[in-house]
Interface confidence: medium
């Protein structure tokens, strides 16, 4: 069976607003759901359409959506059909209409003392309540010879007199909302003793210290009185003026003149006309002081030739609204052409280089004029002054590669080395004119360099190859002091490079020749068996034809390399006892002993009372504590070499002897006992 699991339900709806009639169906097989309105199928429109099985209304319409809706679910296979509960809308609406004369039949028949009935043609559901207005002021029932009922759309004036003259309007409101009359009715019942407006004052805007004039005239028989009031209800007459309106003059024809206007004079001025009979007529006009603010600054603009660009000038705030125009070279721009003004915009079409320059946006009103310049640069593609050249640069000296270009605006130059962008660092520097400086040329700087010069209009590039002229140098320079082990074979290398392969030879510093057991083999000094006499100063000389010669001095020392006679051993000591770590080394020159304990060098001058290093190199620690445990390293060194050996020190608690242990029982590990 087909079952409705969400039923549509009658509901309130608002004209023009959204609504939804819900319908959800459960059935054993597929069903198709459609909607009926007063028995006829509902067709989908943009306004009213099926949403799933529910019916959605984008905007309820009181005419098209009145009636009874029903959701129908049909199984097309079995033909079974189920219908939901009926649902309808209680549509709330309100629609404006005019105020019309209901009685008498025509305006020509309206005379003083006749009954006048006006009708408010605003309709709605639910029925709205009405409010009447004369000249914008609400009318309430039972005042001044008129009858009005909020439920009733008629306004009756009985009898109608001149005091009822005015513009009649009505508004109505209901649960749906509010509407006011689309067309109002002017009732005019003449009474010559009533003041009537002949000339009403207008709002004025004046510049500071200028003059302002308000015109105001009324007519009546006998002539009406006229009075001017300022904001705070202060009367203005030629005899009594308020302090801030000393320069006010009221003329016989009712006009009010204010001279040398100041900010405190700005505000609302009221002109009041009073006839012999009837209500006073109050007319208002506002005096505004003209003002103009400053204009925001323009950022300089860079455009490319051939393009179309616009620069917007935001007018400054001001009263009255400032007028805006553009000037270039002192001439106001036209409203059409290639370079022209459109609204507040400066338009440059098909830009040419000659369009570059200063353009000025002007804004002006009564309060004054403001201007702001914008500097427009027309970008050009860079051109070459000097391209980079293939260059030979000397190693170790500064090298320069030129990249001199010109363009508008000033071009930006970047350099590439082997296609990699060069970022400025301690070795590379790009000058403002585009020249690249290599601060200290290295051999590996010999490669391809490319410079690119750019502006927004485009870029140019060129490349050059750098060849590095190597200087004559030792590679590496020989160590100035070297040691050779006595009675052993030794070699002292010396190599050099230059633009041409240099010749290398050794000689003794005193000029004497090398002994026969010492050979010079392609720059390597070879000692077959070192003797004490081999010690001394030697010179390595590298030379080639173009670059001359260079020398390196080496002092050779003959030494007996260090060996340890006594090395420290793994040592365990009772807490509070003394530890002795022995170390003795021999060599020539005589080695010095240093100790390192717990990863820090033990400075003999800062050891404190518990530690001491003997002349022979042994380390003694008195009154040992657990924190003295660790690895101790004996370091032996002289001017020729350095050697170290290490051993651990363990500090343990003295064991309490057990009954079974005799007094002579040895400890379970090697101990130093003091």
């Amino acid at each position: 069976a087909i079952v409705f699991i969400k039923q549509p339900s009658s509901q309130d709806a608002l004209q023009g607003r959204r609504a939804l009639l819900r319908c959800e169906v459960e059935a054993p097989g597929p069903v198709h759901v459609y909607w009926l309105l007063d028995g006829a199928p509902v067709q989908d429109t943009e306004r009213r359409f099926a949403q799933g099985s529910s019916l959605s209304f984008a905007a309820v319409d009181r005419l098209q959506d009145s009636g009874t809706f029903q959701c129908v679910a049909r199984d097309d296979v079995t033909g079974e059909e189920a219908r939901s509960a009926n649902a309808s809308f209680n549509i709330k609406w309100i629609e404006a209409g005019p105020v019309v004369l209901k009685h008498p039949a025509s305006e020509a028949e309206i005379q003083p003392q006749t009954q006048v009935t006006l009708r408010c043609h605003i309709d709605g559901h639910p029925r709205p309540t009405y409010q009447w207005f004369r000249d914008g002021t609400p009318l309430s029932d039972g005042q001044s010879n008129h009858t009005v009922s909020s439920k009733e759309r008629n306004l009756t004036l009985r009898p109608a007199g001149p005091e009822h003259s005015g513009l009649y309007s009505c508004c109505a409101h209901s649960a749906f909302g509010q509407a006011c009359s689309s067309q109002n009715f002017t009732l005019s019942i003449a009474d010559e003793s009533f003041a009537r407006v002949v000339l009403a004052p207008q709002d004025v805007v004046v510049a500071r210290y200028e003059e302002a004039m308000f015109h105001c005239q009324f007519s009546a028989q006998p002539p009406p009185s006229l009075q001017w009031l300022f904001e705070d209800e202060t009367p203005i007459t030629n005899r009594s003026r308020p302090p801030h309106l000393r320069r006010a003059t009221v003329f016989a024809n009712g006009s009010l003149l204010l001279t040398q206007v100041r900010p405190r004079n700005a505000g609302i001025y009221r002109c009041i006309g009073q006839g012999q009979r009837g209500p006073p007529i109050i007319l208002e006009a506002t005096l505004h002081l003209a003002e103009i603010e400053d204009m925001p600054l323009f950022e300089p603009r860079v455009f490319t030739a051939g393009s179309e660009e616009r620069v917007t000038c935001l007018p400054p705030k001001g009263l009255p609204e400032p007028s805006v125009w553009w000037e270039h070279a002192g001439v106001r721009l036209p409203t059409h052409g290639r370079v022209y003004q459109k609204g507040h915009e400066l338009v440059l079409a098909n830009i040419a280089e000659s369009d570059a320059g200063v353009y000025t946006c002007h804004a002006a009103n009564l309060a004054g004029q403001r201007r702001q310049d914008v500097n427009i640069t027309v970008a050009t593609v860079p051109s070459w002054l000097k391209k980079p050249q293939d260059s030979q640069l000397e190693e170790g000296k500064p090298g320069y590669l030129d990249c001199l270009t010109q363009a508008t605006p000033k071009p930006t130059v970047v350099w590439y080395r082997n296609q990699m962008l060069i970022s400025e660092d301690s070795r590379f520097e790009v000058f403002k004119n585009g020249t690249l400086r290599i601060n200290s040329v290295e051999v590996y700087d010999g490669t391809w360099y490319r410079c690119m010069s750019s502006t927004p209009a485009g870029s140019i590039e060129a490349q050059a190859r750098v060849q590095v002229l190597e200087k004559l140098k030792f590679t590496p320079p020989p160590q100035p002091q070297q040691c050779m082990e006595f009675d052993k074979e030794a070699t002292v290398p010396c190599s050099a490079t230059g633009r041409e392969k240099p010749t290398i030879k050794w000689e003794r510093a005193d000029g004497s020749s090398l002994p026969e057991w010492v050979t010079d083999n392609a720059g390597t000094l070879h000692f077959a068996r070192v003797t004490r006499d081999d010690a001394g100063n030697y010179t390595c000389i590298a030379s080639n034809g173009p670059q001359g010669q260079i020398r390196a001095h080496v002092q050779l020392t003959v030494a007996v390399f260090i060996t340890f006679k006594v090395e420290p051993e793994r040592t365990t000591v009772y807490q509070g006892h003394t530890a002795l770590l022995q170390c003795e080394a021999q060599g020539d020159p005589k080695p010095l002993i240093q100790w390192k304990g717990k990863d820090r060098i033990l400075d003999p001058t800062k050891l404190g009372p518990r530690m001491h290093i003997f002349q022979n190199g042994s380390l003694v620690i008195h009154d040992v504590a657990p924190e003295d445990s660790g690895r101790y390293t004996c370091i032996a060194g002289n001017s020729c070499n350095i050697k170290h050996t290490e051993a651990p020190l363990y500090v343990v608690d003295k064991p309490v002897p057990e009954e079974s242990e005799g007094p002579g029982s040895p400890p379970p590990y090697k101990m130093i006992q003091t």
Epitope: F4, I5, Q7, S9, S10, Q11, D12, L14, E26
Partner: antibody
């Protein structure tokens, strides 16, 4: 006569997830009704959490939608609520309830279970 | 969402008197979509009225509902001792369905 019975822990830790189950007896959860969860903080009014149909279709209160999951187990004739990221403001009596067929008011309610959020 | 406001928060009356409970919605609710519930201390709510004016099964005829648009009323014509509890109204025409904050009817 349809009866509903809520079950689940009475205490949940802050930022934890609440899991409640509602067992339906005296009627089938596969009837044409929708099944809802409603909660009531101590001394306050009622708040609808969401509903489920036996097909698995759900509707949730937008104010809780990001934290709520309602599921149905037709074989056990029960439906469940999971509410994540619990805070002290979620302390309430949680009721399960049945919608009248086709309409969104509640004709049957469980007796409710108090859930306190505290560490 | 539609906000539902009940007034007064507390109503003090004597047994046998007539109680008038008000329920106002922040926007128009179809008369088919308003329900009233009664809740006794420590118990779940119990359906009294649905569709603004239809009494649920087993509800005595001293309870009646009326209203349309945004203003709805529950009237208890002669208060019995067991009627001095809390009453909630609920709109279910627009999702999410929402409840009023409740009116407590207490013995004067």
């Amino acid at each position: 006569q349809v009866q509903l019975q809520e079950s689940g822990p009475g205490l949940v830790k802050p930022s934890g997830t609440l899991s409640l189950t509602c067992a339906v007896s005296g009627g089938s959860i596969s009837s044409i009704n929708w099944w809802s969860w409603v909660r009531q903080p101590p001394g306050k009014g009622l708040e609808w959490i969401g509903e489920i149909y036996h097909s698995g279709s759900t509707n949730y209160n937008p104010s809780l939608k990001s934290r709520v999951t309602i599921s149905v187990d037709k074989s056990k004739n029960q439906f469940s609520l999971k509410l994540s990221s619990m805070t002290a403001a979620d302390t309430a009596v949680y009721y399960c309830a049945r919608d009248e067929s086709g309409y969104d008011y509640f004709d049957y309610w469980g007796q409710g279970t108090l859930v306190t959020v505290s560490s | 969402e539609i906000v539902v406001t009940q007034s007064p928060a507390t109503l003090s009356l004597s047994p046998g008197e007539r109680a008038t409970l008000s329920c106002r919605a922040s926007q128009s609710v179809s008369s088919s979509y308003l329900a009233w519930y009664q809740q006794k201390p420590g118990q779940a709510p119990r359906l009294l009225i649905y569709g603004t004016s239809s009494r649920a099964t087993g509800i005595p005829d001293r309870f009646s509902g009326s209203g349309s648009g945004t203003d709805f009323t529950l009237i208890i014509t002669r208060l019995e001792p067991e009627d001095f509890v809390v009453y909630y109204c609920q709109q279910y025409g627009t999702s999410p369905r929402t409840f009023g904050q409740g009116t407590k009817v207490e013995i004067k």
